[in-house]
Amino acid sequence: QDPYVKEAENLKKYFNAGDPDVADNGTLFLDILRNWKEESDRKIMQSQIVSFYFKLFKNFKDDQRIQKSVETIKEDINVKFFNSNKKKRDDFEKLTNYSVTDSNVQRKAVHELIQVMAELSPAAKIGKRKRSQMFRGRRASQ
Amino acid sequence: QDPYVKEAENLKKYFNAGDPDVADNGTLFLDILRNWKEESDRKIMQSQIVSFYFKLFKNFKDDQRIQKSVETIKEDINVKFFNSNKKKRDDFEKLTNYSVTDSNVQRKAVHELIQVMAELSPAAKIGKRKRSQMFRGRRASQ
């Protein structure tokens, strides 16, 4: 059995997350994950899910009753999602920690917007008419 | 020229993001994007970057001076990053809107944790011994 399972069960007890009513009103993540089979689509969604869990764990990091469980699960996420690659994890953390209300961050983000947009899709690297053809081509091959 | 370029330039003026001092202390996103060539790694990072911009745009959505620019850029992101797929965009938005301080959301998230973890890496779907070999192999290749 994976080490995270026992620790996740411990978290369930702590949060009373085993109660039957928890399943009311659908799932947060599971139904969404079921919608996406393509690896790149899954990564878009899992990126948001992992950042949610990291924020959640941060809020409870000083609670001794679940500290070991949280650390074990975070370690397991680092192995599974970040492939034990600390640079990947660090870059991810940087992105999740930027404050959207900080005026210096806002200015930098807007300053970088054109280059970020240019990289959002592989097709975006060529002229507009060619790109529209490429969108079609990519559509046709999907 | 891509339609978003003119609108991004308009945002630059609005945020004074063309000033020389904006480049001080490195980039927010560009250096991170340069680090990752693999499509799935890029999606992990871009997912966070896109959610940052969406939050930023939300904060300024009522400012008439930049409304058209923001709408054009959001449309462009939807075409490029979400492939004009509204279901993908809707699922993404749901994930970004969950409140990490809501106790019902916390309980649901913990309830779903084991299944989310089980899906974090494709390797997680096979026997544990095989998986640990696969992790070693994948790490070695990165």
């Epitope: 089979k37 | 709408e71 449309e75 075409v79 279901k87």
Partner: antibody, heavy 124, light 111 residues
Amino acid sequence: EVQLVESGGGLVKPGDSLTVSCVASGFTFSNYFIHWVRQAPGKGLEWVATISGRTKYMFYSDSLRGRFTVSRDNAQNSVYLHMSSLRGEDTALYYCVRGYDHSDSNSAADLLHWGRGTLVTVSS
Amino acid sequence: NFMLTQPLSVSGYPGKTIVISCVRSSGSVASHYVQWFQQRPGSAPAMVIYEDSHRPSGIPDRFSGSVDASSNSASLTISGLKTEDEADYFCQSYYGNNQVLFGGGTKLTVL
């Protein structure tokens, strides 16, 4: 009230060109994607092309690529479909249909509002 | 090649329930929204279900839509069948980047 009105259909000969138009009203036109969908007599619906709102990206059916061109004039609330090298099998009722507002996550449904169509007949 | 396959025809008696299926040939049905349209002779298509299971205003709750990932298909269910429901019904979805796909259509006959 959302309205889409197509015009410009008619009888043309094989090999000819024709441009059909669509004028929209009742909504912020530049925010919405617009689709062209056609229906041959007694047949099903076939998607032809789409043009995005402010960015004006063009998307085409694989089978029609190269012969058809979609464009729009946001100042005139108008969309155009230019058809060249027309064939008998292009004979159809051409519908203009409102798409999503992709700048708004709470956009009204795609393909909710349809025009009445304009009939294009290709025959010698 | 991407296809949405519907039965050519379906029939039912007034007051009964009918189901029209729409099977996606490749790609996951769950990865794109599905819409359903009703078309009566001489009229433009009118949406009866959007985004898998939602009804536009004015569409009665006798009409419902669902998606089943296991069979990679969507379904339109009409309960309490009425004579005015007699029409052609088309499912619609997408593939790739904004490429729109329609099913071949199903003729509903109310007996």
